[in-house]
């Protein structure tokens, strides 16, 4: 099974130019326990929370968020109301963090395309990504060179085509999985929207089934202390003047056992270093 990925797409509504919608999805086999949407940067790293969505407990959202909802079991949408005349959303980065079991926490960011045409609603045109497996690490540079050349060739062909737009649906998610997302631990180049900046950070799950309260519980993640990246890949892909990079920061050392965490008992780690235990709450 491939490494999980998170996609983020921001679009302007055709009817109201002051309205924006952020679409986020998780491509992986795990069970999603929480989604956090923030703007201005990643959650906890300069970003401000806009919404938190739990698959069963409900959603919490804060202005300028207008409506946060689940689109599918693995994707969400967040409608934003831009009251300002200068449209600050246009230059803002939006980030989505998916906590999933057993993978851990994955976060990606994206922003509105620089020359967004609100009238377009064409289906997404994922650019195929060549896979670089761990086994083929020696040939990675050659593959990347070939991939870049192929992408540039595709981009020249698509130069005057309209910007692809994502209309999240089960079909599109499957299309993305099949066509655009072919990740591996060594290289996770992913591109489904030429203007989406994908910056995926990852914290792995650590299992801890002995619950401190003595309850039978789902496995919970323990704290993650940085021990230096066990795997890190950043693959730039030039696409119509935009830069797409995917990073996998891997932290492996397990720390203290968390206390009772309530519904779901699923904690998700946060990749910020020693403070990195975020769970149902972000237990200290």
């Amino acid at each position: 099974a491939g490494t999980p990925e998170v996609w983020v797409q921001v679009q302007m509504e055709a009817t109201e130019l002051s309205s924006f919608t952020v679409h986020c999805g998780f491509l992986g086999p795990g069970s999603i326990s929480l989604v956090t949407v923030s703007w201005g940067g990643p959650d906890g790293a300069g970003g401000t929370k806009l919404a938190v969505l739990h698959p069963e407990l409900g959603t919490r959202q804060w202005a300028p968020a207008r409506q946060a909802r689940w689109e599918t079991q693995s994707s969400i949408s967040l409608a934003l109301e831009d009251s300002g005349a200068s449209s600050p959303f246009a230059n803002t980065t939006f980030c989505c963090k998916f906590a999933s079991f057993p993978e851990g926490s994955w976060e990606s960011c994206g922003s509105l395309p620089p020359s967004s045409d609100p009238g377009l609603s064409a289906p997404p045109t994922p650019v195929p990504i060549l896979r670089a497996d761990l086994a083929g690490i020696l040939g990675l540079s050659g593959v990347l060179l070939f991939g870049c050349g192929y992408l540039l060739h595709l981009l020249r062909r698509q130069k005057h085509r309209p910007t692809p737009r994502l209309q999240p649906s089960h079909t599109n998610s499957q299309a993305l999985t099949a066509q655009a997302w072919a990740p591996s631990q060594a290289s996770q180049a992913a591109l489904h929207d030429p203007y989406a900046t994908i910056n995926t950070s990852f914290c792995p799950a650590t299992l801890d089934t002995a619950h401190p309260n003595g309850w039978a519980s789902l496995p919970t993640h323990a704290a993650h202390q940085p021990q230096g990246p066990a795997a890190s890949a950043s693959t730039p892909i030039l696409a119509r003047g935009s830069f797409v990079s995917v990073e996998n920061g891997l932290y492996t050392q397990a720390g203290e056992r968390p206390p009772h965490t309530g519904p779901g008992l699923t904690l998700f780690p946060d990749c910020r270093g020693p403070r990195a235990l975020e769970g149902r709450f972000g237990v200290r």
């Epitope: 401000t48 929370k49 938190v52 739990h54 698959p55 069963e56 407990l57 409900g58 919490r60 959202q61 804060w62 202005a63 909802r69 689940w70 689109e71 599918t72 079991q73 994707s75 206390p259 309530g262 519904p263 403070r275 235990l277 975020e278 769970g279 149902r280 709450f281 972000g282 237990v283 200290r284």
Partner: antibody, heavy 114, light 113 residues
Framework: EVQLVQSGAEVKKPGSSVKVSCKAS????????IEWVRQAPGQGLEWMGE????????NYNEKFKGRVTFTADESTSTAYMELSSLRSEDTAVYYC???????WGQGTLVTVSS | DIVMTQSPDSLAVSLGERATINCKSS????????????LAWYQQKPGQPPKLLIY???TRESGVPDRFSGSGSGTDFTLTISSLQAEDVAVYYC?????????FGQGTKLEIK
Amino acid sequence: EVQLVQSGAEVKKPGSSVKVSCKASGYTFSSFSIEWVRQAPGQGLEWMGEILPGSNSTNYNEKFKGRVTFTADESTSTAYMELSSLRSEDTAVYYCSSYWFAYWGQGTLVTVSS
Amino acid sequence: DIVMTQSPDSLAVSLGERATINCKSSQSLLNSGNQKNYLAWYQQKPGQPPKLLIYGASTRESGVPDRFSGSGSGTDFTLTISSLQAEDVAVYYCQNAHSYPPTFGQGTKLEIK
């Protein structure tokens, strides 16, 4: 262990204000919102609103808008609910809660009486 | 706002018998995207804060005895206690977790017959 500990009971005069505190521990305070719910004697539960510590973003129940203020102090992991222009019908137990009402404070009884 | 209506207002059941509390919402609490119902049930004993029992209409909170179960979809939901115990005497509330503002039912007082 996640805990929400509230301040003690208050007796207030009509027209005055009350400020109830809620100290959180056992989790990262800024991760999730603190909800405020009140319960009049023998009555049901009524959501007043919420605050997200860190950004101090708030949502208010329209019924209380203009009369209630939520604040949060990240340094002490404490949230506050201030209700002004008190009247006798504000006599109730005020609860703080977090994570979709999964955790609750013990409640603070506010009695408004002349 | 979504209005939550519980029935009955009070209920007396013999120990070991089944207790059933109903909750009706003025709007559907089903999210069509992920097919989840956003309804929660709480138990409140005298002098205590409410305690979360069930969320997502049917998921039991950790530590809640399995005699408690939740069912239903859309606008009609049920909390069932399969075999009433003395410690189950309390007021039970359903809650709309679907949309703002969160709203609660008026409560159902459960007593022993």
